[in-house]
């Protein structure tokens, strides 16, 4: 294998630190140069790499969406950590957005788990103790106080 002279635009920008790859791989916080001879540092707050790699570029940092709070900023070795705001959660099967937590359980159910950034409130049937499917109840199903009945809120 032979290599032609590097084109001038391949040379690193001054602010990007360089080191040599180890067995063809660059450490976390770096990516490899086109010719495989140098490790180039990721740009703090812009991109990152978490593992030893031979990729031509670092991965772009995540930007927290509105409705999310930033728990920790992006570094050259770790992506931004975002979390849903209080009162909202993100499910594993729909990770693209934070959803509002339910304010109460359907009729005949009691709350056994609070709203967290990762899960909706958890409801179980009063008698059987089996979990509710997690579907948002229709408005008329939600437990509310009615005249002559003591309120038994789930939240």
């Amino acid at each position: 294998i032979t290599q032609q002279d590097l084109a001038p635009q391949q040379r690193a920008a001054p602010q990007q630190k360089r080191s040599s790859p180890s067995e063809g791989l660059c450490p976390p916080g770096h990516h490899i140069s086109e010719d495989g001879r140098d490790c180039i540092s990721c740009k703090y707050g812009q991109d990152y790499s978490t593992h030893w790699n031979d990729l031509l570029f670092c991965l772009r940092c995540t930007r927290c969406d509105s409705g999310e709070v930033e728990l920790s900023p992006c570094t050259t070795t770790r992506n931004t950590v975002c979390q849903c705001e209080e009162g909202t959660f993100r499910e594993e099967d729909s990770p693209e957005m934070c959803r509002k937590c339910r304010t109460g359980c359907p009729r005949g159910m009691v709350k056994v788990g609070d709203c967290t950034p990762w899960s909706d409130i958890e409801c179980v049937h009063k008698e059987s103790g089996t979990k509710h499917s997690g579907e948002v109840p229709a408005v008329e199903e939600t437990v509310t106080s009615s005249p002559g009945t003591p309120a038994s809120p789930c939240s």
Epitope: Q3, L6, A7, Q9, Q10, I32, S33, D54, L56
Partner: nanobody, 123 residues
């Protein structure tokens, strides 16, 4: 979705020339390399050359250095392989491929492949 379309293959006499083209679409990486490989019947796929998009770094296999030239047209997202002084042993299916790894001269470093174009060198 990444798509690679090779063209320019055909039959040519020994000592003749051909230019292969590979048009790429769906590439959204900050940088990548586009390489050429070939596979003759009953043989392993062989690396020929790669050119990188950002810096223009080029690698050649010794077997084709001086006879084959890789080039690119950034505006058309197309890479070319100019082949000259062709020999019977250059007969093979020629493949275009994309890598996001540095110094990529091994087949396993390539993630996307075209369907290939046949080059036949015979008198």
């Amino acid at each position: 979705e990444v798509q690679l379309l090779e063209s320019g293959g055909g039959e040519v006499q020994p000592g003749g020339s051909l230019r292969l083209s590979c048009a790429a679409s769906g590439l959204t990486f900050p940088n990548y390399g586009m390489g050429w490989f070939r596979q003759a019947p009953g043989k392993e796929r062989e690396f020929l050359a790669v050119i990188y998009w950002s810096g223009g770094t080029v690698y050649y296999a010794e077997s084709v250095k001086g006879r084959f030239t890789i080039s690119r047209d950034n505006a058309k997202n197309t890479v070319y392989l100019q082949m000259s002084s062709l020999r019977a042993e250059d007969t093979a299916v020629y493949y275009c491929a994309v890598t996001i790894r540095g110094a990529a001269t091994q087949t396993w470093k390539y993630d996307y492949w075209g369907q290939g174009t046949l080059v036949t060198v015979k008198p």
